[in-house]
């Protein structure tokens, strides 16, 4: 209620002879700060005195001097909260009732703690989980009911009196709830733990033993089983007897039932510790076990290998890999079942014995088409030789041997011909399902393997042909040597390197790309006249009259190729130059006379130049000069002269005669 | 340095003749790489080319189609002058009226372009 | 005989080139080569500036330059300068009656 103090520490505090103790402690004063404090043993309170009797331990006094006799009790509080105090050492007779004597200025109040003080350091206590399992990690703890700062000590786990080796936690606790010390230890405990001690000592802080506690570890786990075999090393022969026994080594709890197993499964009507077998085969080779169970679970024996040997069965063979691409490597096995392994084999290529083949493995690293056929074998133990088996076929696999291409026609072969070819070849596994014919051409295949080309072309020059069956083998190219007229005719101007001008010493020449056969002849023509028959067509003095419209032709024995039309044209400057008059050579004054200067030239008169009869030029630069309206004094001759890019040429002298108007005359 | 003075009336009333002179300096009329043309230039009709006269053996001369029939051109070689007269003129007519010459001989080679111009005379066609 | 075929207006800022063409038919321009070119200033008669398609009178800049492709005739002035500003007029012997034709003129601005 309102009217107490208000105090927190732990009930009871426990402690041995020359340790020490620690009391944690808090309170709340009724009104205002601590002003006396008086630590009792045993109070007892005097009626009559309205006082505490017993042993003062500690006294505080309003000046705050303490004895010097009371340094073995400290109060480590205050003067309104802290109430902690400290008795360092504590002896036997300090056991029993503490009393704290708190007096403010208005109020007064006693509050009590026990304390409990043994002789000797008393022993820790061990905690178990209720049950331990083999495997399973369980948490033992080891509590001391005490704590002291003044006084160190250390908790030590051991097994069967050995330290162990796991790492514990330890922990401690002084607050006004709990005093103690603990120490956690995580563990997995095998089968083997079971019925060993765990000891939690308690030790000061040089190591030395103070007390201790131990337990004994109950530890469930599956029956732990011995199996023995006779005989011993578990080979036998076939028609030989085996016995396997089982002995149970520890079991916790204790065992239930018996079974056994062969290669991971469970004997039918085999529930004792005794497994007897008669007469056995080579089927009850295998691996044994003996398998028996308690409430944890089930227990197994290592295994046991159980050998019964038997000379090697019929042997089959597989091969790595068929079918095989020649060049390839392959590898044979052969397969017997046999005990003990064979120790030597015989290999038939055939049904002929292969020299010098005696292992389980035969490799071949590059096949040849020889390789084929059918391999078998015969394995050998100690207990005698197998049989040979029905074997296995090996199918070598190459592309197309020896192709060639084969002309079919007779010889030579003209531009136009129709020709037939065949691809032929030795031997192909597999066969072969397809042709190739180099180069690509819209040909006809008439059958598997024959190539007709329709109208061949002069440029057919080589021809090759592959037969294919998983690969294509290709054949040397055929060369078909076409017979063909002259080739690409054209006119070809040797010389002069430039354009033509009249007198220039000219060639043209006749070319052709190609002809087969190399032997031709050539022939020249113009507007359809022959003008010789060598390679070139020469002009000493090339003249106006020389241009035209020219061909070459070369024959040889196939036939004969024209070239197209080469125009030769003959530069040369103006000729020819004349005057002409409109409307003629004699106009009446006042009228319009048109002078046109007429010339024969290539390139074509660019710039014309008009003279009078003084050989004064007139400002004209046309082909036609205008006079309008012309007068009697432009009567005389007039004379052109052209120019072109190769020169310039001048006409004779025209004569314009002007006459006077009826209109002048009558004036006159 | 060749010169060409123009001379001649501002205003000519319609159907009446247009007469300009070109008086020459430093150069003669009779030259004979010379020609001697008169132009026009009117914002309706732009720079147009009325025609030429020179002298070669003898006096020729060249008109332009549009004005051909109304044109004609004149000498005056004592005083070194030519004259333009243009008949029957409508306001059509009416621009800045120029004499030029044409040097037709560059060193050896042909040339034609109109490298002297007289000042231009302004003519109005207007009653 | 109709005119020569100029643009009515060019322009470009000082120191930069201007180009102006003058198109013809094979009769005038494309026939011979005597282009020529003319400057004028407002209030003033026509100055030559490039005779026969590309030469240079004597006194004219050689900022100013003439060429001739087909029946098109090109003046250039490069590094244009302010007093360049003006009227710019080309001119062709032709084959007709008419024996010249000129261009419609081109107004060079100076920006």
């Known amino acids: 209620d309102s009217s107490k103090w208000v105090f927190e520490h732990p009930e009871t505090l426990y402690a041995w002879e020359g340790a020490c103790v620690w009391i944690p402690c808090t309170y709340r004063a009724l009104d205002g700060d601590l002003e006396s404090f008086i630590l009792f043993h045993n109070p007892e309170y005097n009626k009559n005195t309205s006082k505490f009797d017993g042993t003062r331990l500690y006294e505080s006094t309003k000046d705050g001097k303490v004895p010097s006799e009371q340094k073995r009790v400290q109060f480590l509080g205050d003067k309104n909260k802290n109430c902690t105090l400290s008795i360092h050492p504590v002896h036997l007779n300090d056991s029993g009732q503490l009393g704290l004597r708190m007096e403010s200025k208005t109020e007064k109040w006693m509050e009590r703690i026990h304390l409990n003080v043994s002789e000797r350091p008393f022993p820790p206590h061990i905690q178990l989980p209720p049950e331990i399992q083999e495997s399973q990690e369980v948490t033992l703890t080891c509590l001391l009911n005490f704590s002291c700062y003044g006084y160190p000590i250390q908790l030590q786990w051991l097994l069967e009196g050995v330290p162990m080796r796991q790492a514990a936690v330890t922990s401690t606790s002084l607050t006004i709830k709990s005093v103690f010390t603990r120490s956690e230890l995580k563990f997995s405990p095998q089968w083997s733990h079971h019925g060993k001690i765990v000891t939690c000592q308690l030790q000061d802080a040089d190591g030395k033993f103070l007390s201790n506690d131990t337990v004994q570890l109950n530890v469930k786990h599956t029956p732990k089983l011995e199996i023995k075999v006779t005989p011993s090393d578990a080979i036998v022969r076939e028609g030989d007897s085996v016995t396997m026994t089982c002995e149970v080594s520890s079991s916790n709890p204790e065992y239930t039932t018996v079974s056994w197993l062969k290669d991971g499964t469970s004997l039918k009507k085999q529930n004792t510790f005794t497994l007897n077998l008669r007469e056995v085969t080579k089927d009850q080779s295998g691996k044994y076990c003996c398998q028996v169970s308690n409430d944890v679970g089930p227990g197994r024996s290592e295994e046991v290998f159980l050998q019964v040997q038997y000379a090697p069965e019929p042997s089959t063979v597989q091969i790595l890999h068929s079918p095989a691409v020649e060049g390839s490597q392959v590898e044979f096995l052969c397969m017997s079942l046999a005990n003990p392994l064979p120790t030597n084999y015989t290999w038939y290529h055939n049904g002929k014995e292969m020299q010098g083949r005696t292992e389980e493995k035969v490799h071949i690293p590059k096949i040849l088409p020889w390789h084929a056929g059918t391999y078998s074998c015969v394995a050998e133990n100690i207990l005698g030789t197998g049989q040979r088996g029905p074997g296995a076929e090996l199918d070598v696999q190459y592309p197309p041997k020896k192709v060639t291409t084969v002309i079919q026609n007779p010889m030579p072969i003209r531009e136009g011909d129709t020709v037939t070819l065949s691809c032929n070849y030795n031997s192909s596994n597999p066969s072969v399902t397809r042709y190739e014919w180099k180069p690509h051409g819209a040909w006809e295949e008439p059958s598997l393997g024959v190539l007709k080309i329709q109208n061949v072309g002069w440029d057919n020059t080589t021809i090759a042909c592959a037969a294919c069956n998983s690969w294509c083998s290709w054949a040397s190219p055929v060369a078909l040597n076409v017979q063909y007229a002259p080739r690409d005719v054209r006119v070809r101007k040797i010389k002069p390197l430039s354009e033509i001008h009249s007198g220039n010493s000219v060639s043209l020449q006749c070319d052709f790309s190609s002809s087969h056969p190399k032997e031709v002849q050539f022939f020249w023509e113009k507007n359809g006249r022959l003008l010789g028959k060598e390679s070139q067509l020469n002009f000493d003095s090339i003249s106006p009259e020389d241009a035209g419209s020219y061909s070459c032709w070369v024959n040889n024995s196939i036939g004969q190729t024209a070239s197209k039309a080469w125009t030769l044209e003959v530069l040369y400057a103006p000729r020819r130059l004349r005057v002409s008059m409109s409307p003629g050579d004699q106009v009446m004054e006042g009228k319009s006379a048109t002078l046109t200067c007429e010339s024969d030239a290539n390139p074509p008169v660019s710039h014309y130049t008009w003279f009078d009869w003084n050989n004064q030029s007139l400002p004209y630069h046309s082909q036609k000069l205008r006079l309008e309206p012309v007068k009697v004094q432009h009567s005389g001759a007039y004379w052109c002269q052209g120019t072109n890019s190769v020169g310039k040429g001048r006409s004779p002298l025209s004569t314009l005669t002007v006459y006077y108007s009826p209109e002048t005359i009558g004036r006159r | 340095e060749v010169q060409l003075q123009q001379s001649g009336p501002g205003l000519v009333k319609p159907s009446q003749t247009l007469s300009l002179t070109c008086a020459i300096s430093g150069d003669s009329m009779l030259s004979n790489s010379d020609t001697w043309n008169w132009i026009r230039q009117s914002p309706s009709r732009g720079l147009e080319w009325l025609g030429r006269?020179?002298?070669?053996?003898?006096?020729?001369?060249d008109y332009a189609s549009s004005v051909r029939g109304r044109v004609s051109i004149n000498v005056d070689t004592s005083k070194n002058q030519y004259s333009l007269q243009l008949n029957a003129v409508t306001p059509e007519d009416t621009g800045v009226y120029y004499c030029?010459?044409?040097?037709?001989?560059?060193?050896?080679?042909?040339?034609?372009?109109?490298?002297?111009w007289g000042q231009g005379t302004m003519v109005t066609v207007s009653s | 005989q109709s005119a020569l075929t100029q643009p009515a207006s060019a322009s470009g800022s000082p120191g930069q080139s201007v180009t102006i063409s003058c198109t013809g038919t094979?009769?005038?321009?494309?026939?011979?080569?005597?282009v020529s070119w003319y400057q004028q200033h407002p209030g003033k008669a026509p100055k030559l500036m490039i005779y026969?398609?590309?030469n240079r009178p004597s006194g004219v800049s050689n900022r100013f330059s003439g060429s001739k492709s087909g029946n098109t005739a090109s003046l250039t002035i490069s590094g244009l300068q302010a007093e360049d500003e003006a009227d710019y007029y080309c001119?062709?012997?032709?084959?007709?009656?008419?024996?010249?034709?000129f261009g419609t003129g081109t107004q060079l601005t100076v920006l």
């Open positions: 006269t020179y002298h070669r053996s003898t006096w020729y001369d």
């Open positions: 001119s062709s012997y032709t084959s007709s009656s008419t024996l010249y034709v």
């Open positions: 026969d398609v590309s």
């Open positions: 030029a010459r044409v040097r037709l001989q560059d060193g050896n080679s042909w040339s034609d372009a109109f490298d002297v």
């Open positions: 094979s009769s005038d321009v494309g026939g011979y080569n005597y």
